[in-house]
């Protein structure tokens, strides 16, 4: 499976969905980590299919929601949120798989100034 960011690049303060694409229908659990791999990277949040529950991790800020399809919604993103995010899945056979996507965040332009100008 793959991870796609919608939108691919978002201004700070906006919401971004990290969409899990082409995922198996037999997933028992989803775990989102901040980093290029799940191993050794802090857990943001998980979703357990059986009990239909979100599980907050050590890196959970309160702005993240994992949906039953495995996608991760970021609300009110900040520049610090930019980076790599890895989704680890566990299927009905207890096999684990993972994929990594990128969250790109850009600064809001100051109203009235052309792009590239610096507010004094």
């Amino acid at each position: 499976f793959t991870i796609e960011a919608l939108p691919s690049s978002a201004a700070e303060g906006k919401d971004v969905l990290l969409l899990a694409c082409n995922i198996s229908e037999t997933i028992q659990a989803y775990y989102w980590h901040k980093g290029k791999t799940a191993e050794g990277s802090p857990l943001i949040a998980g979703y357990i299919t059986d009990i239909q529950a979100n599980i907050p991790g050590a890196a959970y800020s309160g702005r993240e929601t994992v949906y039953p399809n495995g996608s991760l919604l970021f609300q009110n993103i900040t520049l610090e949120d930019a980076g790599s995010y890895t989704l680890r899945t566990i299927n009905a056979s207890y096999d684990s798989d993972q994929a990594t996507g990128q969250l790109h965040v850009h600064q809001n332009n100051v109203p009235g100034l052309p792009v590239g100008a610096v507010a004094g």
Epitope: Q28, A29, G46, I48, I55, G57, I90, Y94, S96
Partner: nanobody
């Protein structure tokens, strides 16, 4: 290592009740869910009910309003009160302990047979 021992299964008529118990030996983390799954002949094992250390309960839609799960943390025991049983509830019922943060690491009991006759 956690070991699970179920009891309370049996044969009951439709509309009747049964109470399953599952005693766990070993250390269970506070992030674990204790619960019940079932497997009917020729079907896959399915979630029935679960309960957290803090007694948050979770139920499959098919048993809501009929089954009640409870937990005694001091005794490391989980119970499943099954009322208004239906023939389609017939299955082997398995006790399970699963950690929310390591869901693929599960402990399972041997199972207890529940048969509901019409």
């Amino acid at each position: 290592q956690v070991q699970l021992q179920e009891s309370g299964g049996g044969l009951v008529q439709a509309g009747g009740s049964l109470r399953l118990s599952c005693a766990a030996s070993g250390t269970i983390s506070r992030s674990s869910i204790m619960g019940w799954y079932r497997q009917a002949p020729g079907k896959e094992r399915e979630f029935v009910a679960g309960i957290s250390y803090g007694s948050t309960t979770y139920y499959a839609d098919s048993v809501k309003g009929r089954f009640t799960i409870s937990r005694d943390n001091a005794k490391n025991t989980v119970y499943l009160q099954m009322n208004s049983l239906k023939p389609e509830d017939t299955a082997v019922y398995y006790c399970a302990v699963r950690d929310l943060y390591v869901w693929d690491h599960a402990y399972w009991g041997q199972g207890t047979q529940v048969t509901v006759s019409s």
